[in-house]
């Protein structure tokens, strides 16, 4: 009989239904934009925009100030008033499309859907640890803007991304806007532009550089700008757009656009297609070679990575990596595979690929038929010619014109499809110690904080909790303030510690103390918590063993029982080796002697499951009484493990000492050849782990065992004779004198 401990799924060591309450702010309307500010003198603020209003919050998410940003045409609109007395049309709500910090001043810049997409500059005024907004400056000069040429028209009602870069004494706004024919006709926003903020804050300098979707493509070719960021010498925009100007506009893919952050020019504008795939370890029949494509970027964030992930990505620790969450299509619902996948694109590698693409286009010999691309922005041409020109004239450089790199950058899902049905809607990546953590918001209003690591077949969670009861999607933009991240969902802003909201979701001491150091988890009594939550004994160095089950549940009062104990924190050594004198098991008053692990029975335990087994030989003391009792495991003097040492006692009820009684045996005779089916009747015949029926000292092969009955087949007899028949349970003979008669066959 080889009983094995039942597997405990790894998920049983945590509970993601544990409620965490994190600080929040109700904005009074759907949050449209959010940005944080941290000053040099310990002052900080959170700026939250909703329709027609801008809130200023302190670091504690308490309201400090509120500003009316609309409706345009309403005299109560405070930002509108900064543009002076009239004319005030056209009336309309102000949806905030841009909310960015200009770090040079410092100032907050907000741009809305009303008033031709103009922007307002709000100087920041520190007041203690809080920040107030000074009276806004209207970045719009009525006399300098026309419908066909409007340097001060920044925001598109269809969406705009802005990154502010300091160059010398000036602030340059790198602006990317989604357009359609109607928007393009109204005060002419541009698809991509670099605009210099005028020193007197009266607007943006005229004559700025820009690229725009050509009028003939505006109806069919729309570009969504998902994210923008500045790192090193470049500003990057991430887009979702049709894969081709000529083909089906619903066939989308993701591109990265790179612009120089040191020169306000667009001659070195470059685009690169980003290809993210889910490549399951075992490919299904009919699944595409190279994995299933996830062409549509949903959210992105760039961050320096920790040592472990850096090694897996073959880059140096601290290098910047662009992380993107991708889905199969605009609706995000695939037929097979996970809903969301996460791909990592090291920035240095992106830059190298772009530079190689430029070489392919501009350095001889150029592959015939290699196109410059970006036909939605410029006239079609072949490399190395400039757009719209048949040949390169001596005074133009191939490199000084926008280019789509001819090869794409392909990566596979870091999570190996383990996000499953989760639809990720927000992403922020941080480095904590040497660990890289993805903080993700979901479609159903949850936050997942997961270690970014590639080599596992399960997710390493810091946390997985619901932000509130509304279940509304977490919005795309996430901001950091100190050691917290700010997520928006519905009309609320939530402040989530980057170390996780707490430790209560870890249910076992072992899982608790195995948590990352940065989480600050410790064990207090019977729960996992941070020190501030534990009024009593809080410690991070040891765990008691935990008994969850044992087998068998009964044993003979005389004779031994091989007891198998199940649980966790028994020895913390994969080999199952138990140092001498560390583990003491008692059943009732009786000791149970530890047995060495049978190496042939060692099974590899997948990390998604966990259970530990421990075996001992129970020999009841003479003083042991019949009846129910407890099983107790005490572990002491254990050497420290990787995360903690095992120390303490675990007690489990439910073992019973019993006395087997043999009442009847039949038949009492049978052929000398053997094979007679003997039935032994009695009580407690199945207790313990071993039993044997002996006919003249030879084992009668057991066919069935139950509490009241044993069936066995007699062995052959040496001669015709009456021979002794006995029953042993746990190696000890059950009282009674019985004989079996061998007869001629």
């Amino acid at each position: 009989e080889d009983w094995q401990c039942p597997r405990t799924p790894y998920a049983a060591s945590r509970d993601f239904d544990v409620k965490y309450v994190v600080p929040s702010f109700s904005a009074g309307g759907l949050v449209q934009a959010m940005v944080t500010y941290e000053g040099d003198r310990n002052e900080s603020a959170v700026f939250v925009a909703i329709r027609n209003r801008l809130h200023v919050l302190g670091p504690d998410l308490k309201s400090v100030q509120s500003l009316a940003t609309g409706p345009a045409g309403d005299p109560g609109c405070q930002t509108c008033a900064a543009c002076g007395p009239g004319p005030h049309g056209p009336p309309g709500d102000t949806d905030t499309k841009v909310l960015v910090l200009d770090p040079a001043l410092p100032a907050l810049v907000s741009c809305g859907s009303s008033l031709q997409g103009r922007c307002f500059l709000h100087d920041l005024e520190p007041q203690g640890t809080a920040v107030h907004l000074a009276a806004p400056a209207c970045l719009f000069s009525a006399h300098h803007n026309r419908p066909d040429d409007c340097p001060d028209c920044v925001a598109s009602p269809l969406g705009t991304r802005v990154t502010v870069v300091e160059q010398g004494q000036a602030s340059y706004f790198y602006v990317a806007s989604s357009l359609d024919a109607a928007v393009a006709a109204s005060f002419s926003p541009r698809s991509v532009s670099i605009r210099r903020l005028k020193a007197d804050a009266s607007g943006f300098a005229p004559g700025f550089v820009a690229l725009s979707v050509l009028p003939k493509h505006l109806v069919s070719y729309s570009i969504e700008y998902v994210h923008s960021f500045h790192t090193g010498a470049f500003v990057y925009f991430l887009t979702v757009q049709p894969a081709s100007v000529t083909d089906d506009p619903s066939a989308l893919h993701t591109r990265l656009a790179r612009l120089s952050a040191t020169e306000p020019e667009l001659g070195d504008y470059r685009e690169l297609v980003l290809d993210c795939r889910f490549a399951p370890k075992r490919r299904r029949r009919g699944a595409p070679e190279g994995g299933q494509p996830y062409p549509v970027l949903r959210v992105a964030h760039s961050a320096p990575v920790g040592a472990q992930l850096a090694t897996e990505l073959s880059i140096a620790e601290g290098q910047e990596v662009l992380f993107g969450v991708f889905v199969t299509g605009k609706d995000g619902g695939p037929g097979v595979g996970p809903n969301s996948v996460v791909c990592a694109f090291p920035i240095d590698l992106l830059d190298t690929l772009i530079d190689e693409g430029v070489e392919r286009c501009c350095e001889s010999p150029v592959h015939p038929g290699l196109r410059r691309g970006l036909d939605f922005f410029q006239s079609p041409s072949f490399c190395p010619n400039p757009p719209g020109l048949e040949a390169l004239s001596p005074n133009t450089s191939c490199r000084h014109f926008p280019l789509l790199v001819s090869s794409s950058f392909s990566r596979v899902d870091l999570f190996n499809g383990l996000l499953g049905p989760v639809q990720v809607t927000a992403l922020y990546v941080t480095r904590l110690d040497n660990v890289t953590v993805a903080h993700m918001g979901t479609m159903d209003g949850r936050i997942l904080q997961v270690e970014l690591v590639r080599s596992l077949n399960y997710l390493l969670y810091v946390s997985n909790f619901s932000l509130g009861d509304s279940g509304q999607p977490v919005q795309r933009d996430v901001s950091r303030l100190g050691d917290h991240l700010l997520f928006a969902s519905g009309d609320q802003v939530f402040q989530v510690p980057i170390q996780g909201p707490g430790c209560r979701h870890f249910l076992t001491c072992g899982r608790c103390l195995r948590a990352w150091h940065f989480m600050g988890c410790g064990w207090c009594g019977n729960m996992c918590g941070q020190q501030k939550e534990c009024p009593g004994s809080w410690q991070q160095d040891h765990c008691p063993p935990k008994l969850t089950e044992f087998h068998p549940h009964s044993g003979p009062l005389r004779g031994s029982t091989r007891l198998t104990l199940c649980g966790s924190n028994f020895y913390l050594h994969p080999s199952g080796l138990v140092p001498e004198g560390t583990h003491q098991v008692t059943v009732g008053q009786s000791p149970c002697r530890p047995l060495p692990k049978d190496s042939s029975k060692l099974r590899p335990v997948p990390r998604k499951d966990f259970v530990e087994e421990f075996e001992c030989e129970l020999e009841p003391l003479g003083t042991q009484a019949v009846g129910p009792t407890n099983v107790s495991l005490t572990v002491t003097n254990m050497p420290p493990g990787k995360h903690f040492r095992v120390d303490g006692t675990s007690v489990l009820r439910g073992f019973s000492f019993m006395e087997p009684v043999l009442i009847a045996v039949q038949p009492l005779f049978g052929p000398r050849a053997g094979g007679t089916c003997l039935t032994l009747e009695g009580q407690s015949l199945s207790v313990g782990t071993s039993r044997a029926v002996l006919v003249n000292g030879t084992e009668c092969l057991l066919a069935r065992v139950s509490e009241g009955q044993l069936l066995c087949a007699t062995p052959p007899g040496a001669t015709v004779a009456s021979v002794p028949l006995s029953l042993q349970v746990g190696g000890a003979q059950v009282p009674g004198s019985w004989t079996f008669q061998y007869r001629e066959d």
Epitope: D74, C80, A81, G84, S141, H143, D200, S202
Partner: antibody
Framework: EVQLLESGGGLVQPGGSLRLSCAAS????????MMWVRQAPGKGLEWVSS????????TYADSVKGRFTISRDNSKNTLYLQMNSLRAEDTAVYYC??????????????WGQGTMVTVSS | DIQMTQSPSSLSASVGDRVTITCRAS??????LNWYQQKPRKAPQLLIY???SLQSGVPSRFSGSGSGTDFTLTISSLQPEDFATYYC?????????FGQGTRLELK
């Protein structure tokens, strides 16, 4: 304390010139539209001119267009009104006023005490 | 230009009286209307902005109402310091224009 203080008024002959100044204090002058408003003796209030925060754009009442010039020096927190070709009907108390934004949008929320300009031969 | 017409041009009342001054705009100015109080030899002071919003520090006995073309300033219970001239002003567009004023005097 938020304050506006006008100066430069006085008696001038028809056809003559005068330059009014308005010194601002207690607020970020460079953020606000500034205005001149006048009031003839025993009469009502009349808006004269306004200037953008940067000083780049200006607007005038028809009655003074081409004769008056509004300007500002944000580094000195000062507003000016250069009045040329003065006429008898320009006789008035000239007030400098701030155009409100935060708190009190779209109104003259701060006024100076006024300076008297008399055009007479 | 937007015309602003105030009535009455003058008004006699006693302390404790409820007083109403009206202002008519032509054409429609939404709620872009402000009310000012001016005492002799003093600068005007803002009482009400955006037709009905009370300026900070102004007593609550002053209130404003109306939108479009017809507006009202009400003083619920006249106090001795309220005897002054009152002006309405449109802030809808330039040129900014004022009503001709209403002189409120002690009966």
């Amino acid at each position: 304390e938020v304050q506006l203080l006008e100066s430069g008024g006085g008696l001038v002959q028809p056809g003559g010139s005068l330059r009014l100044s308005c010194a601002a204090s207690g607020f970020t002058f460079s953020k606000y539209f500034m205005m001149w408003v006048r009031q003839a003796p025993g009469k009502g209030l009349e808006w004269v001119s306004s200037i953008y925060p940067s000083g780049g754009d200006t607007t005038y009442a028809d009655s003074v267009k081409g004769r008056f010039t509004i300007s500002r020096d944000n580094s000195k927190n000062t507003l000016y009104l250069q009045m040329n070709s003065l006429r008898a009907e320009d006789t008035a108390v000239y007030y400098c006023a701030r155009w409100g934004i935060v708190g009190v949008p779209n109104a003259f929320d701060i006024w100076g005490q006024g300076t008297m300009v008399t055009v007479s031969s | 230009d937007i015309q602003m017409t105030q009535s009455p041009s003058s008004l006699s009342a006693s302390v404790g009286d409820r007083v109403t001054i009206t202002c008519r705009a032509s054409p429609d100015i939404g709620t872009y209307l402000n009310w000012y109080q001016q005492k002799p030899r003093k600068a005007p002071q803002l009482l009400i902005y955006a037709a009905s919003s009370l300026q900070s520090g102004v007593p609550s006995r002053f209130s404003g109402s109306g939108s479009g073309t017809d507006f009202t300033l009400t003083i619920s219970s006249l106090q001795p310091e309220d005897f002054a001239t009152y002006y309405c002003q449109q802030s809808y567009t330039t040129p900014l224009t004022f009503g001709q004023g209403t002189r409120l005097e002690l009966k």
